[in-house]
């Protein structure tokens, strides 16, 4: 994360990722001031002329806001006094990716820190037994990914095995023409085993597990953002 204390106050940011079409958070904290009216928060984006957001004298000041962020930004106004300058970004766009600067002015001085914001699409996979198939088959589906991810199957019993020969993955463009639906099918599945479908791009890594026994099916999913230090 970026820390800058050379301008007399320390500002800290955390690299993060935004999911296209959803709301995102650009994280920034600073040494708090006792008077809200003395705090100025400016969010800038490299390559953009106008401001992403400005908060001063206890309220939003959006006269210099860039058109591409109009109506899409907000700070947590009630948390500014305790040093939270994080920005909420509504309806994240692919073009929101880039380098941002959180610039703070208080009565104690000034400070700033940069953060890298990645944008893409990522979603939790769901693994199911495909009863329509002629042989024992698993179907892993995830509704929204971008950029195109890789899909790898793994098994608890056959650790280290390469399932690329017995699996088939397809990517179907969604209606908004950016994100894609991921479907991967694994053939020749054996009973009493746990299989994992791992979907990964440069923004996120998601895993869908399924445990198939004679008596039951157990599922578990997990999603982790990459390159963002929480």
């Amino acid at each position: 994360f970026g820390i800058s204390g050379r301008h007399s106050i320390t500002v800290t940011t955390v690299a993060s990722a935004g999911n296209i079409g959803e709301d995102g958070i650009l994280s920034c904290t600073f040494e708090p001031d006792i008077k809200l009216s003395d705090i100025v928060i400016q969010w800038l984006k490299e390559g953009v002329l106008g401001l992403v957001h400005e908060f001063k004298e206890g309220k939003d000041e959006l006269s210099e806001q860039d058109e591409m962020f109009r109506g899409r930004t907000a700070v947590f106004a009630d948390q500014v006094i305790v040093g939270n300058a994080s920005l909420r970004l509504k309806n994240v766009q692919l073009t929101d990716a880039g380098t941002y600067k959180c610039y703070i002015i208080t009565s104690k001085g000034k400070g700033n820190a940069n953060l890298e914001y990645k944008t893409g699409a990522f979603s939790m996979p769901e693994v199911n037994v495909d009863y329509n198939a002629s042989s024992e088959t698993l179907r892993c589906e995830a509704p929204r990914w971008f950029p195109q991810p890789t899909v790898v199957w793994a098994s608890q019993v056959d650790q280290g095995a390469n399932f690329s020969e017995v699996s088939n993955t397809s990517f179907e463009l969604n209606s908004e023409n950016v994100t894609m639906k991921v479907v991967s099918v694994l053939y020749n599945v054996t009973i009493n085993n746990t299989y994992s479908c791992m979907i990964e791009n440069d923004i996120a890594k998601a895993t869908g597990d399924i445990k198939v026994t004679e008596s039951e099916i157990k599922r578990r999913s997990h999603l982790q953002l990459l390159n963002s230090k929480a």
């Epitope: 050379r6 490299e46 390559g47 002329l49 106008g50 058109e67 073009t95 002015i105």
Partner: antibody, heavy 117, light 105 residues
Framework: EVQLVESGGGVVQPGRSLRLSCAAS????????MNWVRQAPGKGLEWVSA????????YYADSVKGRFTISRDNSKNTLYLQMNSLRAEDTAVYYC??????????WGQGTTVTVSS | SYELTQPPSVSVAPGKTARITCGGN??????VHWYQQKPGQAPVLVVY???DRPSGIPERFSGSNSGNTATLTISRVEAGDEADYYC????????FGTGTKLTVL
């Protein structure tokens, strides 16, 4: 190596037009906002215009508003300044400069524009 | 519109410290950048964000900014530092100071 090279300057009569170009290399041009800055003979620096990385947003100094147009072609890594209705007071060395947050971190060597009858 | 005022000239003996000021209304709330320009050459950024130095710029160059005045300080001045110096802020466009000619005696 990051480089900006201006071209297109010359001698032109008042009222005529001229187009300046700035070829960028050594960095991802499409990620950065760009500026034109000029300097009249024996005078200080004067900002002329700025354009966002995508080209969607443009700012101009009052002295050139309505006469000059800044544009860019990201596929060619080139910045332009179309100068119409030129006046004697537009005579200057014109620099292109890469915007970095609130300042400019890389400058070209400049191209000279002389407006004279 | 926002204005930045600099002294037209500053003279200093080699090895001494030169201070170039840049005045503007509440400039301390803005981010100030300083450029060096030698005759016949393009400007070069020497200090950005009030007090930070780009790589390749000697530690002798430093900056400060508070209240209504920003200051560029050049310690242990050398003959090669003789140049014009401009301060700059952003205010819906780049605003430059009037420029200061630094003469090394």
């Amino acid at each position: 190596e990051v480089q900006l090279v201006e071209s297109g300057g010359g001698v032109v009569q008042p009222g005529r037009s001229l187009r300046l170009s700035c070829a960028a290399s050594g960095f991802t041009f499409s990620d950065r906002a760009m500026n034109w800055v000029r300097q009249a003979p024996g005078k200080g620096l004067e900002w002329v215009s700025a354009i966002s990385a995508s080209g969607a947003s443009r700012y101009y100094a009052d002295s050139v508003k309505g006469r000059f147009t800044i544009s860019r072609d990201n596929s060619k890594n080139t910045l332009y300044l179309q100068m119409n209705s030129l006046r004697a007071e537009d005579t200057a060395v014109y620099y292109c400069a890469r915007k970095r947050w609130y300042g400019m971190d890389v400058w070209g060597q400049g191209t000279t524009v002389t407006v004279s009858s | 519109s926002y204005e930045l005022t600099q002294p037209p000239s500053v003279s200093v003996a080699p090895g001494k410290t030169a201070r170039i000021t840049c005045g503007g209304n509440n400039i301390g709330s803005k981010s100030v950048h300083w450029y060096q320009q030698k005759p016949g050459q393009a400007p070069v950024l020497v200090v950005y964000d009030d007090s930070d130095r780009p790589s390749g710029i000697p530690e002798r160059f430093s900056g400060s900014n508070s209240g209504n005045t920003a200051t560029l300080t050049i310690s242990r001045v050398e003959a090669g530092d003789e140049a014009d110096y401009y301060c700059q802020v952003w205010d819906r466009g780049m605003i430059f100071g009037t420029g200061t000619k630094l003469t090394v005696l």
